[in-house]
């Protein structure tokens, strides 16, 4: 898909005026709770606070230049980045002896792109090279999409860095959530 060529490290991300984009919460990778490895206890209790803060699947506006090798778009393009969390924690403590592990209390949802839009951009190249016209695919909206435990790693790339759910037939053992994600329990709107 041609548009991916423009979403490279050379892309310049410029926050729009008045926008203070914050990165998405760190989604755990390789932090799945494992009773044997972790003694059944997460390093902290993710449900200590009753505080509720506004935090949900939202669309952050970014302005960036599209680049292709040495060429750069004449004007920046504005696109959305999907950020945030879908709903309250759907993990509940489950006592195992004196320890605790975590189990789901609902489906796992992720804030991901919903619709895309195509935009034609003109790329200016150095050295008198002729301008190039390119079509880029930009995120137009976000949604809270269900992530199943049957998604494999390649499918998960589209959902962000999230550990795969257990395979079919095995009991799900959800990961403990990061301290950052659980500083305050979340109130959301979908």
């Amino acid at each position: 898909q041609g548009w991916q060529a423009f979403k490279n490290d050379a892309t310049e991300i410029i926050p729009e005026l008045g926008e203070y984009p914050e990165p998405p919460p760190e989604l755990e990778n390789n932090k799945t709770m494992n009773r044997a490895e972790n003694g059944g206890r997460p390093p902290h209790h993710p449900f200590e606070t009753k505080d509720v803060s506004e935090y949900s699947c939202r669309e952050l506006h970014f302005t960036r230049y599209v680049t292709d090798g040495p060429c750069r778009s004449a004007k920046p393009v504005t696109e959305l980045v999907c950020s945030g969390q879908c709903g309250p924690a759907r993990l509940l403590p489950n006592a195992i002896g004196r320890g605790k592990w975590w189990r789901p209390s609902g489906p796992d949802f992720r804030c991901i792109p919903d619709r895309y839009r195509a935009q034609r951009v003109q790329l200016l190249c150095p050295g008198g090279e002729a301008p190039r016209a390119r079509k880029v695919r930009l995120v137009a909206s976000c949604k809270c999409k269900r992530l199943t435990r049957f998604h494999n790693q390649s499918e998960l790339k589209d959902f962000g860095t999230e550990a795969a759910r257990p395979q079919k037939g095995r009991k799900p053992r959800p990961r403990a959530r990061s301290a950052k994600a659980n500083q305050a329990e979340l109130e959301n709107a979908y």
Partner: antibody, heavy 123, light 107 residues
């Protein structure tokens, strides 16, 4: 027997608030997030949101954002749904519902429902 | 939000009839489709989850099929207690949404 028992019918004036309760029994209350669904006259079912009884964290349907608050009292195994700034189109039967889980298919569904609470908004 | 469109909105049938209700999602919802039966003055009752899984205790005359965007609930031989309104519900994308309902009436 797993049961959800809701509070009685309410009649409210436009602009007022209503708080509906849902008392759970027959299962461990903190083991399940509680959901709220409403049915307006002549309309279908509409999902309002959910709450995690352990943390008090809630997630709401955008349609009700700012007007609805869901809370729980774990000591009495009771969930509450408060709807503010009531309008005539909020006249509906409000249900609490629990999510059940099928591990084989990794699927969730509303398996236990309260009997419903009729809220009438009228001047 | 994902729109769930049920058809027909109502139908008249006789005891013993085979009844088919369809539910269409505005986008792909995989197999995350549940069916509920609702009678006047009563709470909804789950019949089928994950498109075709029959909840324990639900009569085998109820069956579900489909995937993606098109789903079907079939009652193979309508019984007197089956006259009710049936709702589909998607569980793939938040907010959860329900179909408008199909009322099954006695002919």
């Amino acid at each position: 027997e797993v049961q959800l028992v809701q509070s009685g019918a309410e009649v409210k004036k436009p602009g007022a608030s209503v708080k509906v309760s849902c008392k759970a029994s027959g299962y461990t209350f903190t083991d399940y997030n509680m959901h709220w669904v409403r049915e307006a006259p002549g309309q279908g079912l509409e999902w309002m949101g959910e709450i995690n009884p352990n943390s008090g964290g809630a997630g709401y349907n955008q349609k009700f954002k700012g007007r609805v608050t869901m809370t729980t009292d774990t000591s009495t195994s009771t969930a509450y749904m408060e709807l503010r700034s009531l309008r005539s189109d909020d006249t509906a039967v409000y249900y609490c519902a629990r999510l059940g889980y099928d591990d084989i298919y990794d699927d969730w569904y509303f398996d236990v429902w309260g009997q419903g609470t009729t809220v009438t908004v009228s001047s | 939000d994902i729109q769930m469109t049920q058809s027909p909105s109502s139908l008249s049938a006789s005891v013993g009839d085979r009844v088919t209700i369809t539910c269409r999602a505005s986008q792909d919802i995989s197999n995350y489709l549940n069916w509920y039966q609702k009678k006047p003055g009563k709470a909804p009752k789950l019949l089928i989850y994950y498109t075709s899984r029959l909840l324990s205790g639900v009569p085998s005359r109820f069956s579900g099929s489909g995937s993606g965007t098109d789903f079907t609930l079939t009652i193979s031989s309508l019984q007197p207690e089956d006259f009710a309104t049936y709702y589909c519900q998607q569980g793939d994308t938040l907010p959860y949404t329900f179909g408008g309902g199909t009322k099954v009436e006695i002919k």
